[in-house]
Structure formats: C-alpha cells, structure tokens
C-alpha cells in the first residue's frame, strides 16, 4: 500500500499547533485510503528546505526568495502548488514588481543613475531586492557594502529600515528611515507617496500599488512604468512592462519522488472542506494564534503548478537574475556595449554538429547549446541557458506565450532587398500519391498520416485545426488508422509509422527519420497515405534534388495535392490548392537579447548566408542537404520584422486564433506551464 502521508514542515510552535489541527480535521473528512497529514517541526524555513531534500519532510509553503533557495543545489526542490488571491474566476498567483515614474520625467531604465529613488523597505522584494538586483552590475564599485553602492548610484533615496547613520543618503528623502507605518514613506503606499509628493523620481513597488492608491484613471494617467527594454508604458500594461513577475507563496517539494500529485490531492481536498468560507471549526487560510501560519491568511485557494515547471521557469528569468546578482555578486569585468556571444540552441546531435561548425567559423560570435526537443530549447532560452533559435510558427506561438519575441524572419524567395522585406508566408499542403486516386480531403478517415511534428504549423496546427472543426474532438489518433507525428505519446497510433530506432522512435528531432518536412514526405513515400508539409517540400525532394537513396529516383509528377473543396491538383498548383497560408519560420529570443541577436545574425548572414556560392568548401548557414538544420534549407535571408515584433503581430490574428482553438487539444507541457504564468 503506498504511503499517502504528506509530512508538512512547520517553523514555529504556532505553526506546529495549526498543523496538528489541520491533520486532525483532515482525518475527520477524508476516507482512510485518502491522503493524510503528518507534522514535522523545524527551527527555520531553511531547515525545512533541507529536511524536505533529505526526505525527512515533504512540503512547506515559501515566499519567492526562499523558493529560489529551495531550488539551488543540493536542495533541488520544485514548486508544486501555488496559493492564489483574488477570486476563483480570476485567480492571482503572481504579482509584478514595477518601477513607477511621473509621465513628464523623460528618463528610461538605463538612465536611473543620479535620480532619486523610493523603496518600500530595505531587503524587501519589489522595493529593493528586484530593482537593486537588476541594477546590480550598473552600481559603482565596490558593490559591497551594497547600501553604500546604492547610495552612490542614486542622488538620494528613501529606503525604510536602512541604517541612517551609516548610509544617510538612503534616508535623505525620509529622515530617520523609520521601519514602520510611522514613516509616511514606508511600504508600498509609502514608496508611491514618496514619488507622488515629488520627493523621489522613481518608486519601486508592485503593480497593484498605483491602483490601490489612485482610484481615478485620470490620476493614474499621470504616471508610467519603466520597462527593462528602456521604453515606457501606461501603468495598466504592467504585464508587458515590469521588472519581474513574482510568485506570491508556493508549496515546494522534492523534484524526484516528491509526492507532488499526493500533495495536490491533499490540498485540493483541504480547500474543498476548509477553504475560504467553508468551515467554522477549522480554516486553512486563517491564523488565530499568529499571522500567515502554514499559508497566507489572504490566500483564497490553491492551484496546481504544471509539472513541466521547474523553479527557474516559475520564478522567471528577471527574478532569478536579480536574486542571483545579489547573492553571488558577480558581474562581467567591465560592462561594454559589445554583444556577448549568442548561445544558439541546437536540437539533437545533427543540429549540434552544424552549430559547432558555425561556432568555429563565427570566431566567437556564436556558441552552441543542445537540447532534445524544441520545447526544451524554448525553456533554455527562457531561463538564459540559451539565447536564440529559429522556429516554425507553431513554436513561435508557444515561445511567444512563454515571453520570447520574434527578432528576424526566414525569407524563402529571392528578391533585391530580401533583408528588408519579410514575406507573407508559405503554403501548408496535403500531399498524396497520384496512384491513390480515390483519396480526397473528405475521406481521410482511417488513412495513414505523416506529420512534420506535433505543434508545428504545416504538419500539425493547420491540418489538425481544420480537422478539429470537422470532427469536434481531439482524438486524431482515432481518426487516422496510424501515422507518424513526432512528439506524440509513444504508445499512440500516431507513432506507429515512425522509423526512429529505440528511444528515438517518434522523437521530435532529427534522430527520428520521419521528422520535419523531408521526414514527413519520406514517410509518405515509404509508408503513408497523406503527408502534411509545406508547398516546397515535394519539388525539393524529387527530380534528383535529394541524393539520399529513398529520394533520388522520385518524380514530382507522381504526387498530387488535396484541396479543401474535395478536388486534387498537381503539386505546382499549390497557390490554388492548399490548406492555409503559414507564417514563415522566425528567430526568437528573450527581450533583453533582442538587439544583440539581431545585430549578430545580420553580420553572420552577410558572412555565411546565400551569398556564399560554394558550400562544399565553405560554411553555409542555410544549407544542410534537405535536413533543415538550424534554419530551413530554402532560406534566402533573415529579414527584419519592422513592426511585427511580437508573436501576435508576427503570426497574424488568423493564425493565432487557429492555434488558440487547437489549444484544447494541446499536449504541450511547456504551453501549459507558460499559460500558468500568464493566462
């Protein structure tokens, strides 16, 4: 019988008492085969973290700063359940740390030196740790003691709780630096008042502070937010303009064997019986003998943290950067305007080899990072382990939902000013063998299908979106008799046709021979009835253009396209017989790397792009013998996006809507994790 006990860690006598009450009340409402609580008392949160890591306890609720400590080796804990605030309909699990300024003040984030600053309090998250952590490498040296460096950075400050004797500049705007509400500039509202009164130029608070202090929109319109990309935005656009997104209070557990499902089962049942307004005798979110015991008194309930989410992803790149800077205190030798090497994310060993060759030819401009799947790469770019990669539109959507931005688009048509003219897109098509003359778009049920990969545009999102509209369910593996859709569950019929050996079977990378455009077409040639690819795939792999044994004798005339009206057309008539127009593949990166990725890639394509005529003797960025490694092989150049610089603008309303509709069928664990951070 599996042990269904969750050992909760308590950090004080009062918490231990509440924990025992929690345990007893849960016993009274949960059947004997359900989850139960045991209480473990430790002297501090750090002791609780260590106890969980050592398997002496299972769970504890932590503030964001401690979630970071819990994640660090050797603890390796992960977030499993989040407290939420507000309503069940609009649950808030995060708050945003923001920098508020007056509208007419005219400076940006990178111009804060010499300004006057208002802080909620020394050592507090939104008011100190996050802004000072992010500004850390701009502070004058020596950076220790930190208070002295901050005092020398700003021309005056109010940082309540600072030592006014040692660091008078930190108390210049609020004499005495009182550490309670007796100081009119203490806390969130106090820091905002410090700005409002004209004492300071910038206030470091949380996103709700301005709404709580100014009910009137006209008053709020006198203020703006400073964004990390050195722009400003209105105060209600805090989701797109903040210093960090911070989880409020989170239950953590071991990453391996951490009982996360059991902890959720326990807390979900606990909130049903003892949540807000549920029971008089025991209340989960109330602390009669103290404040915020076990859980925050202001919490309204719990939400399960998606399993794909580790602490780095949960805390977010900005928060982790800020806290790491403060803790480790390391900065580059001397900040320069030089761009650091771009860390390109390569999928599996084929792409890694091409990336390594690019890296040595780039003379230090490109470094390589490997991952096994596109989603793993996106996650690495999110957390700073990698910087950029080129993605199919379906993954541009996921990357966008995860906070990444498109920076350059692949262009596939030769033109005079290729780099200045991003194209409208390519065509997603359904290809069949000419010999299967009875096959049409209307009778695909029970046939064998070949897809580039799950989540990709031409191979999945477009055809499956159209199919979903017809069949109104997500069981595509029942619609087709079998197929190869790399990235499907291994036991699915949509992995049955795949050719990868062993663990590589149906993997969404080049170790699976039927992966990607060329792979899906090969699947059709060798085993399938229909392949969902791009309009250039057939000509690129027939007529001797692909020298591989399976392709060298193929003839374009032996294949036809399925049109949505139930007819068929020759392959060259794709403009009048396609499933939809697909946005071109695009390079994505984090917002903070956008300028450098843009600059370095434009240099790289001038050196190694399609102007290189002899790819047998020189490195060519856009060539890999039909394997589409790092970039599509038919890329002519990487083009500027002009104003299409967000994922929504880049992909276009129609495509975003189509993928959004297909979201209910999504098996993307990364998309689930990212929409948890930003619903």
């Amino acid at each position: 019988v599996p042990d269904k006990t969750v050992r909760w860690c308590a950090v004080s006598e009062h918490e231990a008492t509440k924990c025992q009450s929690f345990r007893d009340h849960m016993k009274s409402v949960i059947p004997s085969d359900g989850p139960s609580v045991a209480c473990v008392k430790k002297a501090s949160y750090l002791d609780c973290i260590r106890a969980i890591a050592a398997n002496e306890a299972d769970a504890v609720t932590l503030d964001a700063g401690l979630v970071y400590d819990a994640y660090l080796a050797p603890n390796n804990l992960k977030p499993v359940v989040a407290e939420f605030y507000g309503s069940k309909e609009d649950p808030q699990t995060f708050y945003y740390a923001v920098a508020v300024v007056k509208k007419d003040s005219g400076f940006q984030m990178n111009q804060l030196r010499g300004k006057k600053s208002c802080h909620t309090g020394l050592g507090r998250s939104a008011g100190w740790n996050i802004p000072i952590g992010l500004l850390y490498c701009d502070l004058p040296e020596p950076r220790k003691p930190l208070e002295k460096a901050v005092a020398n950075f700003f021309s005056g400050s109010c940082a309540p709780c600072a030592d006014g004797t040692d660091f008078p500049q930190l108390c210049q705007l609020c004499p005495g630096c009182g550490c309670s509400t007796l100081n009119q500039y203490f806390g969130y509202s106090g820091a905002f008042k410090c700005l409002k009164d004209g004492a300071g130029d910038v206030a470091f608070v949380k996103h709700s502070t301005i709404f709580e202090n100014l009910a009137n929109k006209a008053d709020r319109d006198q203020y703006e937010l400073l964004c990390l990309d050195n722009t400003r935005k209105p105060v209600d656009e805090y989701k797109d303009c903040h210093l960090a997104q911070v989880p409020s209070h989170t239950v953590v557990a071991r990453s391996m064997g951490g009982k996360e499902d059991l902890i959720w089962e326990l807390l979900n049942q606990a909130q049903e019986h003892f949540g807000k307004d549920k029971s008089k005798e025991f209340q989960l979110f109330s602390s009669p003998h103290g404040k915020d015991l076990l859980f925050k008194d202001s919490a309204h309930g719990f939400l399960k943290v998606p399993p794909r989410m580790d602490a780095k992803m949960y805390l977010g790149y900005e928060y982790v950067t800020a806290i790491r800077n403060l803790r480790e205190g390391t900065c580059p030798e001397a900040p320069t305007d030089e761009c650091k090497p771009v860390k390109w994310c390569a999928l599996s060993h084929h792409e890694r080899l091409k990336c390594d060759e690019w890296s040595v030819n780039s003379v230090g401009k490109i470094e390589c990072v490997s991952a096994e799947t596109t989603e793993d790469c996106i996650a690495k770019i999110m957390n700073g382990e990698a910087d950029a990669m080129s993605l199919d539109g379906g993954f541009v959507y996921i990357a966008g939902k995860c906070g990444l931005v498109p920076v350059l688009a692949e262009n596939y048509n030769k033109s005079d000013n290729c780099e200045d003219t991003p194209e409208a897109g390519y065509f997603a098509i359904a290809v069949v063998k000419k010999s299967a003359s009875d096959l049409t778009w209307d009778n695909l049920k029970g046939k064998k299908s070949c897809h580039t990969a799950v989540g990709r545009t031409a191979g999945w999102n477009i055809p499956m979106g159209l199919l979903y509209n017809k069949i109104n369910h997500c069981r595509f593996d029942e619609f087709f008799s079998e197929g190869c859709a790399p990235g499907s569950k291994k036991d699915s019929s949509l992995c049955k046709l795949c050719m990868g050996s062993g663990l590589n079977l149906c993997e969404p990378n080049n170790k699976e021979g039927y992966y990607g455009y060329t792979g899906a077409f090969r699947c059709l040639v060798e085993k399938g009835d229909v392949a969902f690819v791009k309009h250039q795939t057939v000509p690129q792999n027939t007529g001797g253009k692909n020298p591989d044994p399976w392709a060298k004798n193929l003839n374009e005339k032996d294949y036809e396209l399925l049109c949505l009206d139930g007819t068929r057309k020759p392959v060259e008539e794709y403009a009048n017989c396609h499933l939809a127009r697909a946005p071109n593949h695009a390079v994505v990166t984090r917002k903070d790397k956008e300028a450098c990725v843009h600059k370095i890639l434009r240099q790289q394509q001038h050196l190694f792009g399609s102007n290189v005529t002899d790819c047998s003797g020189n490195f060519c960025l856009f060539r890999s013998e039909t394997k589409d490694l790092l970039f599509r092989d038919d890329t002519v150049c990487l083009a500027k996006l002009h104003d299409r610089n967000t994922y929504e603008k880049y992909l276009g309303e129609e495509y975003v809507k189509a993928v959004g509709n297909l979201r209910k069928c999504s098996t993307s664990s990364l998309l689930e994790a990212c929409t948890f951070r930003r619903p």
Partner: nanobody, 117 residues
C-alpha cells in the same frame, strides 16, 4: 566519399602528452572545417576542438590551454596535440569533416585515449 582515419591514441599517465592525427582521403579538396570530438562511455559525443580552413580555432572550455588543434592542408591532415592530460580526458576521439558529417552521420573508427596511472 571522404575517408577519415584517426591515429595516435594510447595509454598515458596523468600529466602526459599525446598527438592525434586524422588523415582525410577521397574528395578532400573541398573540406572546410575539421573537428575533433570525443565520447566517453555512457556520455554524449562532445566537441573538443575545431579548425577552419583559414585557421580559426575553437576549444571546449575543459581543454583550453592544454590542447592545440592544427591542420596541414597540403597533407590533408588535422592534428590534436594534447598536453597535461587528465583522467577525465579518457575517451574515444573521433575526427570529423563537417561538410558531410551532419547530413550523413559519417564518422571514422576513432582512436582510444586512456589517461590512467
């Protein structure tokens, strides 16, 4: 088809040196970048060093300052001089011609390097 033949491996004590050679034969006039990779038991194959036809080089962090890659275009040969060897350098070392390897999974047979006292 390019043939790559590696040699020069062997058993050496920590702190010792070895020089690996890789000779390319076949249609080698067009080889641009050459690289040395290594694979230890149970580990992924990893880049050790690479060199372009013009002599640009790249090294993995763990071998910087100890290993030197060079090439002799006239002899169609790439070398890896390995000094101050450590036990963690133990692996099979492969040389690769990038212009083919990433499409055709083509590798030579490799040469075993063992660093042990």
């Amino acid at each position: 088809q390019v043939q790559l033949v590696e040699s020069g491996g062997g058993l050496v004590q920590p702190g010792g040196s070895l020089r690996l050679s890789c000779v390319a034969s076949g249609s080698i006039f067009s080889i641009n970048t050459m690289g040395w990779y290594r694979q230890a038991p149970g580990k992924q194959r990893e880049l050790v060093a690479a060199i372009t036809r013009g002599g640009n080089t790249k090294y993995t962090d763990s071998v910087k300052g100890r290993f030197t890659i060079s090439r002799d275009n006239a002899k169609n040969t790439v070398y890896l001089q390995m000094n101050s060897l450590k036990p963690e350098d133990t692996a099979v070392y492969y040389c690769t011609d990038y212009s083919r390897s990433y499409y055709q999974d083509y590798w030579g047979q490799g040469t075993q390097v063992t660093v042990s006292s």
